[in-house]
């Protein structure tokens, strides 16, 4: 007989204490964890369950994006009676269980954070053996990854009528402000498209018409720092070509 229960409540505070003798399933996760790109972060997750002294096989799972159906980023399994949860999956080798599932702790450490890790994560525990039961966090914990700006692309492109335009794309969190400077420009915020659709941390700024030869510099800045990159425009006057 395989039985499973979902409790409709999910506690968002790690401090909540359950003292009732007949525990119900619940999970305690914070709403959000913040960390900087390149650093490590800990995603806390503790749970209570109704199966007193459960000692059978268990699996701990973390998934990203959406509960129940999102892709797994971490999975480990502990054999009956064992406190060792043997890792079966760790995406890119960057996820490691900090907690002890036998002690109702599924907390996860994520190493070498990147902006792409900025998503919601959901913990899940599964029992099998004499007791079959599972429970998953419905709301999850949002991992908010911050990063100083980085210019990922800067280029000069041809426009109609032998003109040229410049594009600068930068990433960062908070999304950086972009500014162009160059010949006869001073400082220009220049048609910022921010952020790009489907690329939450990318910001693009365009200089629609480059009227003078010379060096054009794009500066990206947010609360964590600044970055700049330059392109050079040199046109062969009297001809239709250009050198950048």
């Amino acid at each position: 007989f395989v039985r499973t229960k979902i409790d409709t409540t999910e506690n968002l505070l790690n401090t909540e204490v359950h003292s009732s003798p007949a525990q119900r399933w619940s999970m305690q996760v914070p709403p959000e964890v913040s960390a900087e790109a390149g650093d490590a972060a800990v995603l806390p997750c503790t749970f209570t369950h109704p199966h007193r002294h459960y000692d059978g096989p268990l699996t701990a799972i973390w998934r990203a994006g959406e509960p129940y159906a999102g892709p797994q980023v971490f999975r480990c399994a502990a054999a009956r009676g064992s406190e060792l949860c043997q890792t079966a999956l760790s995406l890119h080798g960057r996820f490691r269980l900090l907690g002890n599932p036998r002690r109702n702790d599924l907390s996860l450490r994520v190493e070498r954070l990147a902006l792409a890790d900025d998503r919601r994560y959901f913990c899940r525990v599964e029992f099998a053996g004499d007791v079959h039961d599972r429970y998953e966090s419905r709301h999850g914990v949002r991992l908010h990854v911050t990063a100083a700006p980085r210019i990922v692309n800067i280029s000069v492109l041809p426009s109609p009528a032998h003109a040229f335009r410049a594009l600068c794309t930068a990433e960062g969190e908070p999304p950086p402000a972009l500014a162009w400077s160059g010949p006869a420009l001073g400082n220009s915020l220049a048609a910022v498209r921010s952020p790009r659709e489907g690329h939450g941390h990318l910001v693009t700024a365009e200089l629609p018409a480059l009227t003078h030869d010379g060096r054009y510099t794009c500066t990206a800045a947010n609360s964590l720092g600044r970055s700049e990159a330059s392109v050079y425009l040199f046109r062969f006057h009297g001809a239709s070509g250009a050198s950048t």
Partner: antibody
Framework: EVQLLESGGGLVQPGGSLRLSCAAS????????MSWVRQAPGKGLEWVST????????YYADSVKGRFTISRDNSKNTLYLQMNSLRAEDTAVYYC???????????????WGQGTMVTVSS | DIQMTQSPSSVSASVGDRVTITCRAS??????LAWYQQKPGKAPKLLIY???FEHRGVPSRFSGSGSGTDFTLTISSLQPEDFATYYC?????????FGQGTKLEIK
């Protein structure tokens, strides 16, 4: 492309045997529980069997227990259903189905094969 | 075993109508319920899982609700492609069981 492709169905006499296969592609096969679900002509869906991602545990409907065996070869990304002592009431389209997000549990079946017809008749 | 009972067994409706299908479990299954759509000669397709979560790619006109023993699938505004048979299924305990199906026909 994420898909499941069943094969091995056909006509078999009562008491005979058949082995169904389900080839999976496009996902990490060993990470998910897999199941067989059948549908008799003009009837509804009936769960037949489930196997955990690593093959550690298998579960069966009472109607097939002792006659059918579910197995998987994770190195070949293939699920099997060995059907012995077949009866007329086993006549159905057999679907293999993937669990939505777990290697031990089938919270729901999010991916289905196209089905393979098994006819048991003399 | 847990029995799943769907109602109605069949329903006639027109494009644009709002349609509700109910599913009742013979015991408390918490939220472990899924809904599927099946068209003739085709495999079932997952619509809703864990009672209320829309499967990715499923149009937002499909929604699920309920917990315990009573569940509902609602199609807010019927489209021509929605005419099919719908099944509920519990995954609370093995043996997993399906409802008998609800055939949605064009009026």
């Amino acid at each position: 492309e994420v898909q499941l492709l069943e094969s091995g169905g056909g006509l078999v006499q009562p008491g005979g045997s058949l082995r169904l296969s389900c080839a999976a592609s496009g996902f990490t096969f060993s990470s998910y529980a897999m199941s067989w679900v059948r549908q008799a002509p003009g009837k509804g869906l009936e769960w037949v069997s489930t196997i955990t991602g690593g093959g550690e545990s298998t579960y069966y409907a009472d109607s097939v227990k002792g006659r059918f065996t579910i197995s998987r070869d994770n190195s070949k990304n293939t699920l099997y259903l060995q059907m012995n002592s077949l009866r007329a009431e086993d006549t159905a389209v057999y679907y293999c189905a993937k669990a939505i997000g777990s290697s031990w549990y089938s919270d729901a079946f999010d991916l289905w094969g196209q089905g393979t017809m098994v006819t048991v008749s003399s | 075993d847990i029995q799943m009972t769907q109602s109605p067994s069949s329903v006639s409706a027109s494009v644009g109508d709002r349609v509700t299908i109910t599913c009742r479990a013979s015991q408390d299954i918490s939220s472990w319920l899924a809904w599927y759509q099946q068209k003739p000669g085709k495999a079932p397709k997952l619509l809703i899982y864990v009672a209320s979560f829309e499967h990715r790619g499923v149009p937002s006109r499909f929604s699920g609700s309920g917990s315990g023993t009573d569940f509902t699938l609602t199609i807010s505004s019927l489209q021509p492609e929605d005419f099919a048979t719908y099944y509920c299924q519990q995954s609370y305990s093995i043996p997993y069981t399906f409802g008998q199906g609800t055939k949605l026909e064009i009026k």
